[in-house]
């Protein structure tokens, strides 16, 4: 089999509040009922895990309570939102999708979404 294809947008600009959203879509070779989605950040060849969630098809994604990610799923599409981003978090955010159950296991890795984060300028002090 070929690698499971995972598609995601090439570039996303975070909002002024440090929130970025993007869609991660995968071409499922089978009828998966349990899916694991992991967001990885790659910068200067260093890779770190941002967040991960396992969900049952048709159910909501459940991230850990302290996660900076939230998301929803619809079919073979996952809508991901990352919050609390700052300029130093700019980087390539890669969507990794694993079809956990039923067997066989499939793994697909997207080419990444370059998220640009610009810290807002502080408001000037008022003279009033």
């Amino acid at each position: 089999c070929k690698a499971m294809h995972v598609a995601q947008p090439a570039v996303v600009l975070a909002s002024s509040r440090g929130i970025a959203s993007f869609v991660c879509e995968y071409a499922s070779p089978g009828k998966a009922t349990e899916v694991r989605v992991t967001v990885l950040r790659q910068a200067d060849s260093q890779v770190t895990e941002v967040c991960a969630a396992t969900y049952m098809m048709g159910n909501e994604l459940t991230f850990l309570d302290d996660s900076i990610c939230t998301g929803t799923s619809s079919g073979n599409q996952v809508n991901l939102t990352i919050q609390g981003l700052r300029a130093m978090d700019t980087g390539l955010y890669i969507c990794k999708v694993e079809l956990m159950y039923p067997p066989p296991y499939y793994l697909g890795i997207g080419n990444g979404t370059q998220i640009y984060v610009i810290d807002p300028e502080p408001c000037p002090d008022s003279d009033f």
């Epitope: 070929k2 690698a3 060849s45 895990e49 990794k96 296991y105 890795i109 080419n111």
Partner: nanobody, 126 residues
């Protein structure tokens, strides 16, 4: 279905050598990372060595540099790990892993691996 089958493990004396083989099947992409990982009792799985299918970039753990050599035979879809000057601390179960990456991904990063073989045990003892 992706299958990775390891062989070549066994019992060897300190200072000895072993050659591990990993035969990959069921995966038709010509771009991937494939490598060797090991897990000693009570420890986490760690990368030993890895090679990129296209271009042949390699990576080694500091603890095995100069002693272990990874190579591949793309015509046989097989990767080899030549292990020389073996030490007691090399004792572990050795796993073959595959990462279905593309050129944008960092070479041989453990986060990208997901396909695993069953493992082959290597014991270094006198």
């Amino acid at each position: 279905e992706v299958q990775l089958v390891e062989s070549g493990g066994g019992l060897v004396q300190p200072g000895g050598s072993l050659r591990l083989s990993c035969a990959a099947s069921g995966f038709s992409s010509d771009y991937y990372d494939i490598g060797w990982f090991r897990q000693a009792p009570g420890k986490e799985r760690e990368m030993v060595s890895c090679i990129r299918s296209s271009g042949g970039s390699t990576k080694y753990a500091d603890s095995v540099k100069g002693r272990f050599t990874i190579s591949r035979d793309n015509s046989k879809n097989t990767v080899y790990l030549q292990m020389n000057s073996l030490r007691a601390e090399d004792t572990a179960v050795y796993y073959c892993g595959l990462a279905p990456i593309s050129p944008v991904h960092a070479v041989c990063n453990q986060h990208y691996f997901g396909y695993w073989g069953q493992g082959t045990r290597v014991t270094v003892s006198s």
